[in-house]
């Protein structure tokens, strides 16, 4: 084994290095000392380190480690943060487009139903946005509310335009009749199926991205234990105490130390791998009725067809509703 | 392509969300994200090695520091000696992950379970529960991009019409069209506290 170079007789080099870490030289001995109070950089002979220096080295080592960890995860963190933001905005744009398409459909085909239809459509798409962002709203309830709200307007404006405007009494009856008589056929059910499937997947996709950010943030800001700090100090700084300023840690030694320091973090690995593969599986399935862009941007046409269905069955519906809601209508005509 | 009748749209404006290709769609962007994420699949298991390779480590030098003394880089002592009579590395490993790490592992387990239950099994294009009470699902041909509703050859085909990153925004409200939302690129500004 080659003999170690003689320690710096004056600790001058050590002082100048340490000064970069800690301005003020009062902690660095003038000449090598026995160092019997040292707890980490245990000396084999005289040393240029003091207990205070050792503590500062430990602090610096842990800080170095935290910075290295942050720089390691920077690209990954940015990738997920940027995509989470882009997708969230893109989904908002899809919802806004879908709302505008639906409003335009009403304006062009059923002008007599506006502005009430605009209001109900607006409320529906607001709920869609809130649901995507994690709000505790039931999709079936959203769709039911849309059709419950639309039907009284369709009935009073399209099917039975002779009714007076102040149709509050009959409105409640019409809302009930809408479900009991399956006024829109199976269109509400079709829309429920498509919207709930596509929004569930969209919502979990965004949740997963946001959790990805949380995972990186958690490991990014880990505080390393004192034991780890001591190991890092021994690896990176104890050589300074012997005046070995330019020497670097052995590669294998570094790996052993890092595995020790990061044993807890590495436990995430299994679940992180599973996370990425599960997210890939979800994304592969995000098409057709599992793709909110596809479903929401086509919603206006399904709603249009549902109204056409009502019109095709208008004769039978008007008769049945006339009987069912007769009491409400009589009250109004008085 | 999707059927969006022209008379539906009053205003046509260019919508840009980020600086990316014109033909990019939400689904292509999702796939691109997954491909990039997959390059980070070993991120956590590779961390120790990554940190060693990005901190001062003896590579070309004959001699290296093993925590106690200067040794030859390829000697047995290079990895072992520095650990003798030091605090026990095994002990350090046995302590288990920090509470925050355990918490995040639990959250990952939960989201993984959710992702698995939400994933569409291969081969199941549309749920057959659309068959009930008159609506029928049918098959979407493999050659089709997307389909909606209950049709086979012609469910509503939408080629992810919202080219969400550089696309015509068919907004009725002129003010509704978002402008450029450029993301800042990360700055390489970490301060290193190493001194050799």
């Amino acid at each position: 084994q080659p003999p170690p170079p003689p320690p710096d007789a004056t600790c001058h080099q050590v002082r100048s290095f340490f000064q970069r870490l800690q301005p003020g030289l009062k902690w660095v001995p003038e000449t090598p000392v026995p160092g019997s109070d040292l707890q980490v950089c245990l000396p084999k002979g005289p040393t240029c380190c003091s207990r205070k220096m050792e503590e500062k080295y430990q602090l610096t080592a842990r800080l170095n480690m935290e910075q290295l960890l942050q720089s390691a995860s920077m690209e990954l963190k940015f990738l997920i943060i940027q995509n989470a933001a882009v997708f969230q905005e893109a989904f908002e744009i899809v919802v806004r487009h879908a709302k505008n398409y639906t409003n335009a459909m009403f304006k062009n085909n059923y002008p007599s139903l506006t502005p009430q239809a605009f209001e109900f459509v607006g409320e529906f798409f607001t709920d869609v946005s809130l649901y995507i962002l994690g709000s505790d709203i039931n999709v079936d309830d959203m769709v039911n509310e849309l059709f419950d709200s639309l039907f009284p307007v369709i009935y009073t404006q399209l099917m039975n335009p002779g009714l007076p405007d102040s149709a509050l009494d009959i409105n409640e009856c019409l809302r009930g009749a809408r479900r009991d008589l399956k006024v829109f056929g199976n269109f509400p059910k079709l829309i429920m199926t498509q919207v709930s499937k596509s929004l569930q997947v969209t919502r979990i996709f965004l949740q997963a991205l946001n959790l990805g950010i949380e995972v990186i943030n958690t490991t990014d800001h880990l505080k390393f234990s004192k034991d780890c700090g001591r190991m890092l100090t021994r690896m990176w700084y104890c050589s300074y105490c012997q005046g070995l300023m330019m020497v670097k840690p052995c590669g294998g030694y570094c790996n052993v130390v890092m595995q020790g320091c990061m044993a807890g973090v590495v436990e995430i690995d299994k679940y992180w791998r599973e996370y990425i593969l599960s997210l890939e599986e979800l994304v592969n399935g995000m098409y057709r009725i599992y793709d909110m862009e596809n479903v929401l941007l086509g919603l206006f046409s399904t709603i249009h067809d549902s109204i056409q269905y009502v019109q095709k069955n208008a004769g039978k519906l008007t008769t049945t509703i006339g009987k069912l809601c007769a009491h409400s209508q009589q009250r109004q005509y008085r | 392509s999707a059927y969006y009748p022209e008379d539906l749209f009053i205003d046509k404006k260019v919508l840009k969300v980020a600086h990316v290709e014109h033909e990019e769609t939400l689904s292509s962007r999702r796939r691109e994200l997954i491909q990039k994420l997959k390059s980070f699949i070993s991120f956590y298991s590779a961390l120790p090695g990554y940190i060693c390779s990005h901190s001062p480590v003896a590579e070309n030098d004959t001699l290296c520091w093993n925590g106690q003394e200067l040794v030859e880089r390829y000697s047995q002592k290079a990895a072992r000696n520095g650990m003798k009579n030091q605090f026990n590395l095994h002990e350090l490993k046995m302590k288990g992950p920090e509470p925050v790490v355990s918490q995040i592992i639990d959250k990952l387990k939960h989201i993984n379970q959710l992702l698995r239950t939400m994933s569409v099994p291969k081969g199941r294009v549309l749920d057959k529960n659309l068959d009930e009470e008159g609506f029928e699902s049918g098959d979407c041909g493999d050659d089709e991009d997307e389909c909606i509703g209950g049709s086979g050859d012609g469910m509503m085909k939408v080629k992810n019409q919202l080219r969400f990153l550089a696309e015509l925004a068919y907004d009725l409200d002129v003010d509704d069209v978002p402008g450029n939302n450029q993301q800042a690129t990360p700055k390489d500004n970490e301060i290193s506290t190493f001194h050799n």
């Epitope: 046409s301 249009h304 056409q308 095709k312 004769g315 039978k316 | 059927y3 909606i148 509503m156």
Partner: antibody, heavy 119, light 107 residues
Framework: QVQLQQSGTDLARPGASVKLSCKAS????????ISWVKQRTGQGLEWIGE????????YYNEKFTGKATLTADKSSSTAYMELRSLTSEDSAVYFC????????????WGQGTALTVSS | DIQMTQSPASLSASVGETVTITCRAS??????LTWYQQKQGKSPQLLVY???TLAEGVPSRFSGSGSGTQFSLKINSLQPEDFGTYYC?????????FGTGTKLDLK
């Protein structure tokens, strides 16, 4: 002028499936529903169901749910009807017909497709 | 489902004659009734809808009447091209159903 062109005569084995087509021209395909009607030899007409080409949503006569699947392809202005698990009872002439406005009045009909189910 | 019954099932008449075909609905369908004509080996053709409105291009010798459950189609001064089978159909709601048919042939 409005035309509905149906696929030609079809012969199928019992248990098999068959897909009939109806190509529309002369009007905006997505604006009107397409219905399918069955007529057995020497018998009356039966409404099978309709497809709303705009959204691709089908609606069925309960009697034909599970037997017929209606689809539409907007790009080619074509409506399709698939009949599955064929039996001799399915031997008939099948017509496609265009809706006249928002009602079950059929103003234009295809020429019909004769389907024979025989082993 | 609403049942539609036509009478007579068949009818023989000569060119120039006037004939009336009737259709009865199993429940009140108001005026939601359509009449079609079908010739041998051909597809049906729309004649009358909403019980009495003549479809475009249909000669004025055809006329529809009735409401509720009883309807009729009257053909004045029969022409050679008028022979065939006539079907009534309600369009009161889902599912639309057709009558049993009335075959009109040359005497």
């Amino acid at each position: 002028q409005v035309q509905l062109q149906q696929s030609g005569t079809d012969l199928a084995r019992p248990g098999a499936s068959v897909k009939l087509s109806c190509k529309a021209s002369g009007y905006t395909f997505t604006s009107f529903g397409i219905s399918w009607v069955k007529q057995r030899t020497g018998q009356g007409l039966e409404w099978i169901g309709e497809i709303y080409p705009r959204s691709g949503s089908p609606y069925y006569n309960e009697k034909f749910t599970g037997k017929a699947t209606l689809t539409a392809d907007k790009s080619s202005s074509t409506a399709y009807m698939e009949l599955r698990s064929l039996t001799s009872e399915d031997s008939a002439v099948y017509f496609c017909a265009k809706d006249f406005g928002s009602s079950y009045v059929f103003d234009y009909w295809g020429q019909g497709t004769a389907l024979t189910v025989s082993s | 489902d609403i049942q539609m019954t036509q009478s007579p099932a068949s009818l023989s008449a000569s060119v120039g004659e006037t004939v009336t075909i009737t259709c009865r609905a199993s429940e009140n369908i108001y005026s939601y009734l359509t009449w079609y004509q079908q010739k041998q080996g051909k597809s049906p053709q729309l004649l009358v809808y909403n019980a009495k409105t003549l479809a475009e291009g249909v000669p004025s010798r055809f006329s529809g009447s009735g409401s509720g459950t009883q309807f009729s189609l009257k053909i004045n001064s029969l022409q050679p091209e008028d022979f065939g089978t006539y079907y009534c159909q309600h369009h009161y709601g889902t599912p639309p159903t057709f009558g049993t048919g009335t075959k009109l042939d040359l005497k």
